[in-house]
Interface confidence: low
């Protein structure tokens, strides 16, 4: 029978019907011109699940610098400013696309790579496992 | 700084500086093989600043499907399960790279594009402006 093609949002690297090599113009078009440049820059401090931003640098990757969020506490900050361990600070992770130089050190040849980054933290109710 | 020698097996490039147009292999390498596949998938419901995920689809973009977080409430969920408007649910936004077909409808020609996406929500203390 005929296989229904996979949704193009989930490309299959083994799929023969997906182009292997393409030309990419690195002159970035930024579609965020109307957004507030400060955006969520102060949320990391004001959140009930605050986080620190760590610089992850890799010259073989484009972009070479990515900022990773690390939650400051296991718990969340309560109204008194104390850490409440009945709640959990957890990282919100997202898969993003980056370009990886391939072969290594090549100036104009890349492979798409999917990496998981932590963007910030949120406060969640813990999953409680009751012992029978 | 130390210059990394160019790999002799690299494709030829006319641009001696940072390349404008590069070759990209779309056979995605996924570096997240050791991560928990569930990841943060249930955080959107368990968070004190819960969010819904909206599908953003654009066939001229790669990836063509991106999920956008929209915070459910203006306030945050308190210990009683009610919305507390003394706190604010805010989206955590991240700039990500996508590929945009250029010229439009071309099968193997893209431009890098930076777009702002909301990944999830976090609960923050509001900024209170005191009137003098």
């Amino acid at each position: 029978g005929i296989t229904i093609p996979r949704n193009p949002g989930c490309p299959n690297s083994e799929d023969k019907n997906f182009p292997r090599t393409v030309m990419v113009n690195l002159n970035i078009h930024n579609r965020n011109t109307n957004t507030n440049p400060k955006r969520s820059s102060d949320y990391y401090n004001r959140s009930t699940s605050p986080w620190n931003l760590h610089r992850n640098e890799d010259p073989e990757r484009y972009p070479s610098v990515i900022w990773e969020a690390k939650c400051r506490h296991l718990g969340c900050i309560n109204a008194d400013g104390n850490v409440d361990y009945h709640m959990n600070s957890v990282p919100i992770q997202q898969e993003i696309l980056v370009l990886r130089r391939e072969p290594p050190h090549c100036p104009n040849s890349f492979r798409l790579e999917k990496i998981l980054v932590s963007v910030g933290c949120t406060c969640v109710t813990p999953i409680v496992h009751h012992v029978a | 700084g130390i210059t990394i020698p160019r790999n002799p097996g690299c494709p030829n490039s006319e641009d001696k500086n940072f390349p404008r147009t590069v070759m990209v292999n779309l056979n995605i390498h996924n570096r997240n093989t050791n991560t928990n596949p569930k990841r943060s998938s249930d955080y959107y419901n368990r968070s004190t600043s819960p969010w819904n995920l909206h599908r953003n689809e654009d066939p001229e973009r790669y990836p063509s499907v991106i999920w956008e977080a929209k915070c459910r409430h203006l306030g945050c969920i308190n210990a009683d399960g009610n919305v507390d408007y003394h706190m604010n649910s805010v989206p955590i936004q991240q700039e990500i790279l996508v590929l945009r077909r250029e010229p439009p409808h071309c099968p193997n020609s893209f431009r890098l594009e930076k777009i702002l996406v909301s990944v999830g929500c976090t609960c923050v203390t509001p900024i209170v402006h005191h009137v003098a």
Partner: antibody, heavy 111, light 107 residues
């Protein structure tokens, strides 16, 4: 199974109108482009136009511009070709065809 | 509009023959070329896309090559079911345009 089923063809007088339908099934309609391509008796293939059901964007061949309109109803997964001011040279078999964005060729055609 | 010129317009060949059809674009179309097979009374079927990628389910005796302005469809060993008309098509710019077709007949 991916399917495109055309309907609505018939005999019409010069200057008349006709609406063709292309019912799609077995795939995400909004993730594709739908093309209309025609073939006059004993002749080759001629592209008529396309639509992105996702955005509603359309594009037409010069030979039909202003006379033909392509539309889509995403709730019905159906594309339409409205043909007005028909001429003798529009006599042809009309095919609808699907184009997935990550291939840019027409991989499924109606019959 | 970009013109796609196919040659020959028709050819006679025998089962087992190697058949080559060429397509020339009036301007550079990178590798944005597809090849289709059409039998009488039937809709076209995709064989090759992006100049050289074999579409799934298409026998490996079909191959495509080329970039820029010159493209080739090759059938390495002609089979009885391959007697049909073949079209090239560019999708580099709007409007997409087809070649005039090459009819492959039994010798």
């Amino acid at each position: 199974e991916v399917q495109l089923v055309e309907s609505g063809g018939g005999l019409v007088q010069p200057g008349g109108s006709l609406r063709l339908s292309c019912a799609a099934s077995g795939f995400t309609f909004t993730s594709t482009a739908i093309h209309w391509v025609r073939q006059a008796p004993g002749k080759g293939l001629e592209w008529v136009g396309w639509i992105y059901p996702y955005s509603g964007n359309t594009n037409y061949a010069d030979s039909v511009k202003g006379r033909f309109t392509i539309s889509a109803d995403t709730s019905k997964n159906t594309a339409y070709l409205q043909m007005n001011s028909l001429r003798a040279e529009d006599t042809a078999v009309y095919y609808c065809a699907r184009q997935v964005p990550d291939m840019w060729a027409m991989d499924y055609w109606g019959q | 509009d970009i013109q796609m010129t196919q040659s020959p317009s028709s050819l006679s060949a025998s089962v087992g023959d190697r058949v080559t059809i060429t397509c020339r674009a009036s301007q550079d179309v990178s590798t944005a070329v597809a090849w289709y097979q059409q039998k009488p009374g039937k809709a076209p079927k995709l064989l090759i896309y992006s100049a050289s990628f074999l579409y799934s389910g298409v026998p490996s005796r079909f191959s495509g090559s080329g970039s820029g302005t010159d493209f080739t469809l090759t059938i390495s060993s002609l089979q009885p079911e391959d007697f049909a008309t073949y079209y090239c098509q560019q999708s580099y710019t709007t409007p997409p345009t087809f070649g005039q077709g090459t009819k492959v007949e039994i010798k």
